[in-house]
């Protein structure tokens, strides 16, 4: 518990005094929050938070989902917790298995556990099959396991949590990770023709090709000295994973002579941008 | 519980731009991906975008690239979604959803966004 | 992208019998036995609600009269037996791949 300079707020005391507290499911949660300042309970669990305006948070039959962060606040804005654990064998992780990665990020598996004493907590390959060598991750029974920087050969990758219970490995459900890729060069354009030369009423179509890493490549064509929008129509393809080509068509379908000018197809990602132009000569 | 809530309406002129909100409460905003859904009747709904919790990434529909802007004010534990250049193609419901071990488990009640001049 | 085809686009069934609605994917949405589709259901005036979530779990809160099943391209959402509170816009969705898209939408009448 904290201990306080006399004059200055304090926080509030939480009954038990401890950081961690072990429940098995279908006992009951009884915490006490005393402060004379006491304004509420704030219980933080993987899903969602709740509030309770009374000092004595009291659950009767503890289930896993109640485990997690209580959080006593007193008037001042000071705070004191303590996180539960509910111990259920039949519910060993608390699992949200939305997973996804950005690439060099570390990114966190959401397996929370409901009994800290079981050991070695860990991730595991789908159907026995290995992780990646290289993947590394830290484990917090709190939070869930965090792969370490994440590399863009994981896509896609199939795991698992897992303890030992008992002498036996308990796996969770499975987890997908889903990997955005890092930007690491600027996309790469071409155009379909380098210049035009038409007839008034023609019709003009040009293709840009972009191809990079993934679709949040920005694209657009622009007429030079001009900030008008252009109608472009859009085709797209993934070629496998962070193989990704765009094709960004644009048509004008009678042809004037004040059409004449360069035409540039610009493409932008966090890295960089390029851009590629084409020119279009319109005669009488 | 969970609830997050939208403006109700919003008219715009053509050729201006919007910005609506998505406040969320009752879970920890940082921890969770926010998508934002198109809704009309021509086009049924249609996948906008999303902003991963954390890092403030984005991932967009290529339809709406350019179109839509995702940002998200942690402090006030509030997603935006800008959109420009408004045309009577983007009047029509938008709605935030909260995506949850895969699925979008929450949804605010949608903005009506009316284009008229 | 994944095109989402619901059938039928409309359908009316008695109250107390069974009806079904059919989703194909033009592409698998299966990575390692999970099938990441979902269903929802929407009133008017309304946002969509989850029913079913990866294919065939049911939605905490939601009645078990509806199930979902089905993998890779097809699935189906069946509601045994129908109620009048059920009249409602049916739509699939699937997070697999970018740009998640959800299908057309089934509207279902009570006879």
């Known amino acids: 518990q904290p201990s306080v300079s006399p004059g200055e707020p304090s926080p509030p005391s939480i009954h038990p005094g401890k950081s961690d507290l072990i429940v098995r499911v279908g006992d009951e949660i009884r915490l006490l929050c005393t402060d004379p300042g006491f304004v509420k309970w704030t219980f933080e669990i993987l899903d969602e938070t709740n509030e309770n305006k009374q000092n004595e948070w009291i659950t009767e039959k503890a289930e896993a989902t109640n485990t997690g962060k209580y959080t006593c606040t007193n008037k001042h804005g000071l705070s004191n917790s303590i996180y539960v654990f509910v111990r259920d064998p039949a519910k060993l992780f608390l699992p949200d298995r939305s997973l996804y990665g950005k690439e060099d990020n570390d990114t966190l598996v959401r397996c929370p556990l409901t009994d800290p004493e079981v050991t070695n907590y860990s991730l595991k390959g789908c159907q026995g099959k290995p992780l990646p060598k290289d993947l590394r991750f830290i484990p917090d029974p709190k939070a869930g396991i965090m792969i370490k920087s994440v590399k863009r050969a994981y896509h896609r990758l199939c795991l698992h949590c897992s303890v030992d219970q008992e002498g036996k490995s308990v796996l969770s459900e499975k987890f997908i990770l889903k990997v955005r890729p890092a930007f690491k060069a600027v996309p790469v354009v071409s155009v379909s023709k380098a210049s035009y030369l038409l007839r008034e009423g023609e019709e003009f179509t040009v293709t840009c090709t972009i191809k990079d890493v993934s679709s949040s490549v920005y694209s657009t064509w622009k007429r030079e000295n001009s900030q008008t929008k252009l109608q472009e129509k859009y085709n797209s393809w993934h070629h496998g994973d962070f193989n990704y080509e765009r094709q960004a068509t644009l048509t004008i379908s009678s042809a004037r002579v004040n059409d004449s000018g360069v035409f540039m197809c610009y493409a932008n990602n966090t890295f960089g941008s390029a851009n590629v132009t084409t020119t279009l000569e319109v005669v009488d | 519980q969970v609830q997050l809530q939208q403006p109700g309406a919003e008219l715009v002129k053509p050729g201006a731009s919007v910005k609506m909100s998505c406040k969320a409460s009752?879970?920890?905003?940082?921890?969770?991906?926010m998508h934002w859904v198109k809704q009309t009747p021509g086009q049924g709904l249609e996948w906008i975008g999303v902003i991963y919790s954390g890092n403030g990434d984005t991932s967009y529909n290529q339809k709406f690239k350019g179109k839509a802007t995702l940002t998200a004010d942690k402090s006030s534990s509030t997603a935006y979604m800008q959109i420009n250049s408004l045309t009577s193609e983007d009047s029509a419901v938008y709605y935030c959803?909260?995506?949850?071990?895969?699925?979008?488990?929450?949804w605010g009640q949608g903005t009506l966004v009316t284009v008229s001049a | 992208n994944i095109v989402l085809t619901q059938s039928p686009a409309s359908l009316a069934v008695s109250l107390g019998l069974r009806a079904t609605i059919s989703c194909r994917a033009s592409e698998s949405v299966d990575i390692y036995g999970n099938s990441f589709m979902h269903w929802y259901q929407q009133k008017p005036g309304q946002p969509p609600k989850l029913l079913i979530y990866?294919?065939?779990n049911l939605e905490s809160g939601v009645p078990a009269r509806f199930s979902g099943s089905g993998s890779r391209t097809d699935f189906t959402l069946t509601i045994d037996p129908v109620e009048a509170d059920d009249a409602a816009t049916y739509y699939c969705q699937q997070n697999n791949e970018d740009p998640y898209t959800f299908g057309g939408g089934t509207k279902l009448e009570i006879k």
């Open positions: 959803a909260r995506e949850r071990d895969t699925r979008f488990g929450n």
């Open positions: 990866l294919a065939s």
């Open positions: 009752g879970y920890t905003f940082t921890s969770y991906n």
